[in-house]
Interface confidence: low
C-alpha cells in the first residue's frame, strides 16, 4: 500500500498558485506524484510523475472555487488521492506592493507599485484583479515605537511638515475595503529629512 | 454567479454570416474579460476571441479578418459577428467570462471561470 503525500496545501502568492507537499516514508524505493485539477466533471493532469513535491497551478481562473488533488506512485501501485479546495482570489495571499521614497526638504514623496502577478502581462498588477484596491501607509520617526497610519487616495501620498534632519521609515502595503483583507507589508524605508524650506520674512 | 446564455447558431453555406449574442448576468465585479470558444467534434475546446472592459480584442489566427467580436455594455451582451464561414468553423461556440483584464492565457479554457451552456454552428459546403 502507497501512502498518500503528506501535508497537503497551496502556497499562493499574489496568484501564483504552487500546490505543495511532503513525500511520506516508503521502504520500497521513491515515489513519484500526479497532481490534478477538476474541470467540467473531469479530473485533468496537471503535473505527472513527477518526482517534485510541488505543482504550479497558477493558470487557474481566478474567481471560483478549484478542487485540486494529489497522490503518490510506486510502479503499478498508488496511494489513494488527497483533495483540496481552493478560490485564488479570496485565498491567495497578497504580498508587498514596491514603493518609491524622495526627500524633498521637509517632506517624503512616495510612489506606490501595486504586486505583479507573474503569470500575466509584465503590465498586469492585483488592482487590475480587485477593484477595492487601496494602500495603507505605515510611517513613524526611526528609533521611536509611535506608527502613524494613512490610506491614500491614490498610487502616490507625500509626508508634509516632518521635522527636518530627522530620519522617518515607511512601509506600505495593499489592502481591500470590500473584503477588510490586508496584504503584507513592504519592507521598510527610511530616509532623512533635509532643511524645512519656508523662507524667514 | 454569472449566467451567460448564447443563442443566433445555426446552419449556413459555406461563405455565409452568422451573428451570435450573449446575454449575460449576475456580474459581482465591475470588469471582466468576455470571449468566444468552440469545441468541434472529437477536438479540445479553442479560444476564437476575447474583449476586454476596456474594449481592446484579440482573435484566433484562424479567424481573424472574419470574425468581429463585440459588446453592448448596456445591454450585457456580446456578440461574435462571422462571416466568410467555412465548414472548418463548425463547431459548439461558448460564451466565457472571466475575472478582470483578460489575459493571454484566455485562450486556454482552464484558465476561465464562467461559461455558457453553447450554441451549435454548422457550416456546409
Known amino acids: 500500500m502507497v501512502p498518500p503525500p503528506e501535508n497537503v496545501r497551496m502556497n499562493s502568492v499574489n496568484f501564483k498558485n504552487i500546490l505543495q507537499w511532503e513525500s511520506p516514508a516508503f521502504a520500497k524505493g521513491n515515489l513519484t506524484f500526479t497532481a490534478q485539477y477538476l474541470s467540467y466533471r473531469i479530473f485533468q493532469d496537471k503535473c505527472m510523475n513527477t518526482t517534485l513535491t510541488e505543482c504550479d497551478f497558477s493558470s487557474l481562473s481566478k474567481y471560483g472555487d478549484h478542487t485540486l488533488r494529489v497522490r503518490a506512485e510506486f510502479a503499478d501501485e498508488h496511494s489513494d488521492w488527497v483533495n483540496i479546495t481552493f478560490c485564488p482570489v479570496d485565498d491567495t495571499i497578497i504580498g508587498p506592493p514596491g514603493m518609491q521614497v524622495e526627500v524633498l526638504a521637509d517632506s517624503l514623496h512616495m510612489r506606490f507599485l501595486a504586486p505583479k502577478i507573474e503569470n500575466e502581462y509584465e503590465t498586469w498588477t492585483m488592482k487590475n484583479v480587485y477593484n477595492s484596491w487601496t494602500y495603507n501607509v505605515q510611517y513613524w520617526k526611526n528609533g521611536t515605537d509611535e506608527k502613524f497610519q494613512i490610506t491614500p487616495q491614490y498610487d502616490f501620498e507625500v509626508l508634509r511638515n516632518l521635522e527636518p534632519w530627522t530620519t522617518y521609515c515607511v512601509q506600505v502595503r495593499g489592502f481591500l475595503p470590500d473584503r477588510n483583507k490586508a496584504g503584507e507589508w513592504s519592507e521598510p524605508v527610511c530616509e532623512q529629512t533635509t532643511h524645512d524650506e519656508t523662507v524667514p520674512s | 454567479q454569472v449566467q451567460l446564455q448564447e443563442s443566433g447558431g445555426g446552419s449556413v453555406q459555406a461563405g455565409g454570416s452568422l451573428r451570435l449574442s450573449c446575454a449575460a448576468s449576475?456580474?459581482?465585479?465591475?470588469?471582466?474579460?468576455m470571449g468566444w470558444f468552440r469545441q468541434a467534434s472529437g477536438k479540445e475546446r479553442e479560444g476564437v476571441a476575447t474583449?476586454?472592459?476596456?474594449?481592446?480584442?484579440r482573435y484566433a489566427d484562424s479567424v481573424k479578418g472574419r470574425f468581429t467580436i463585440s459588446k453592448d455594455n448596456a445591454k450585457n451582451t456580446l456578440y461574435l459577428q462571422m462571416n466568410s464561414l467555412k465548414p472548418e468553423d463548425t463547431a459548439m461556440y461558448y460564451c466565457?467570462?472571466?475575472?478582470?483584464?483578460?489575459?493571454?492565457?484566455?485562450?486556454?479554457?482552464?484558465?476561465?471561470?464562467?461559461w455558457g451552456q453553447g450554441t451549435q454552428v454548422t457550416v456546409s459546403s
Open positions: 466565457a467570462a472571466d475575472l478582470a483584464d483578460c489575459a493571454p492565457s484566455i485562450y486556454s479554457d482552464y484558465d476561465v471561470a464562467h
Open positions: 449576475g456580474y459581482t465585479y465591475s470588469s471582466y474579460c
Open positions: 474583449i476586454d472592459s476596456d474594449g481592446s480584442t
